[in-house]
């Protein structure tokens, strides 16, 4: 029985972090609110303080343990509650039975680097961060390249339908500055979504050799 104007969305990063966003129309900005996590089959529970991210929206990260520790599995169910302080009491403002491996959003890929660059080509690699070993190779990636005079939104998406942590960009223009981003998504989970985009990697193609056709 939580109000229809309230929205409570959480994602598990597959290791030791659940990130939550709660929004409610007409909620008071100065109210102290928390997210409480109560797993159904674990001895621990966890709390984080919701902090405002907009006029009617709050966010927080439940840190369940060391970044690479596997704190939840596919059989876990975690009761997540938004509690807001009213005088002495905490009021339950939102509640959900959260299935972590149905609601996955991994951390953005890291350690992007140029492996090899030519006039028309660039080979780039990256690493995934804090991703569960449960996925084995069941991951996919999307990549995009920012060309001069364009926006990220205009950049065509390149899809890698397997766990491939590198890409060879082709048909690039010589002596041109580009930026590159990649994101990752597990194949598992009904409500799983793409990770945030990685930090952009800037690179420049080599100039065309003098006296040669480009």
């Amino acid at each position: 029985a939580v109000n229809g104007t309230s929205q409570f969305t959480c994602f598990y990063n597959s290791r030791a972090n659940i990130s939550c966003v709660w929004s409610q129309d007409g909620a008071l900005q100065d109210t102290s609110c928390q997210v409480h996590a109560w797993p159904d089959r674990r001895r621990w529970n966890q709390t984080c303080e919701l902090l405002p991210v907009s006029q009617a929206s709050w966010a927080c990260n439940l840190i369940l343990g060391a970044p690479d520790s596997q704190k939840l599995t596919t059989v876990d169910i975690v009761t997540l509650r938004v509690l807001c302080r009213e005088g002495v009491r905490w009021r339950v403002m939102a509640i959900q039975d959260f299935k972590p491996f149905e609601n996955l959003r991994l951390m953005a890929p890291i350690s992007l680097q140029v492996v090899h660059v030519e006039t028309h080509r660039c080979n780039i690699s990256w690493e995934i961060s804090q991703a569960s070993h449960y996925f084995e190779r069941h991951l996919e990636f999307e990549a995009r390249t920012l060309s001069p005079g364009h926006t990220w939104e205009e950049a065509p998406l390149l899809t890698l339908k397997q766990k491939q942590e590198w890409i060879c960009l082709e048909t690039l223009t010589p002596d041109t500055q580009y930026e590159f981003q990649v994101r990752v998504k597990p194949l598992q989970g009904e409500f799983t979504t793409w990770s945030p985009w990685s930090q952009p990697l800037a690179f420049r193609t080599k100039p065309a050799a003098l006296g040669k056709d480009t």
Epitope: A1, G4, S6, L83, G87, V88, V92, A94
Partner: antibody, heavy 117, light 112 residues
Amino acid sequence: QVQLQQWGAGLLKPSETLSLTCAVYGGSFSGYYWSWIRQPPGKGLEWIGEINHSGSTNYNPSLKSRVTISVDTSKNQFSLKLSSVTAADTAVYYCARGTDTAMADYWGQGTLVTVSS
Amino acid sequence: DVVMTQSPLSLPVTPGEPASISCRSSQRLLHSNGYNYVDWYLQKPGQSPQLLIYLGSNRASGVPDRFSGSGSGTDFTLKISRVEAEDVGVYYCMQGTHWPWTFGQGTKVEIK
């Protein structure tokens, strides 16, 4: 099984301070709200105030200037003090436990406090 | 303060028959989280009150299913589907939405 057991002086003179204590047995003290409620003879119930395990309090505005509720988590006890009592404070005083959803799910046995000169 | 008005104040009942108590509040009790913080308590003769219903319609642990609560906003009802002799006593509604929490004046249920 949660039990609340309360005690304190039952007979007071006007202007004295009422003092009651409630001990909680068989349950956790943190995560709940601990209240005092009173019932004058033959009348209805009045909420006096409540406290949580960390000591935050809510007092009924009608009594706020005279009421102090405190907690001793090491003993799983909480207490009520009501200063400058008059005959109008004669009542059965109850301690109670509350949850996030129910205001008072367990009650003490009640203590009759009579104020008379 | 929120005024809770119960009716009737006295309710003679026949065992096996249904009974109903109404409680009306002077302010809306629907919290912004969608819950009505309304409790119902029974005070049997010579005893402390005991919780019957919380959040308007949820039966407390150990309460027989002949007791049910309903309502939202300002109008709430406690129903006993078939009254038993042990159900006699004073029934109180109480609101926990607006501080200070306040009780109704009580409804005395007695066997005819």
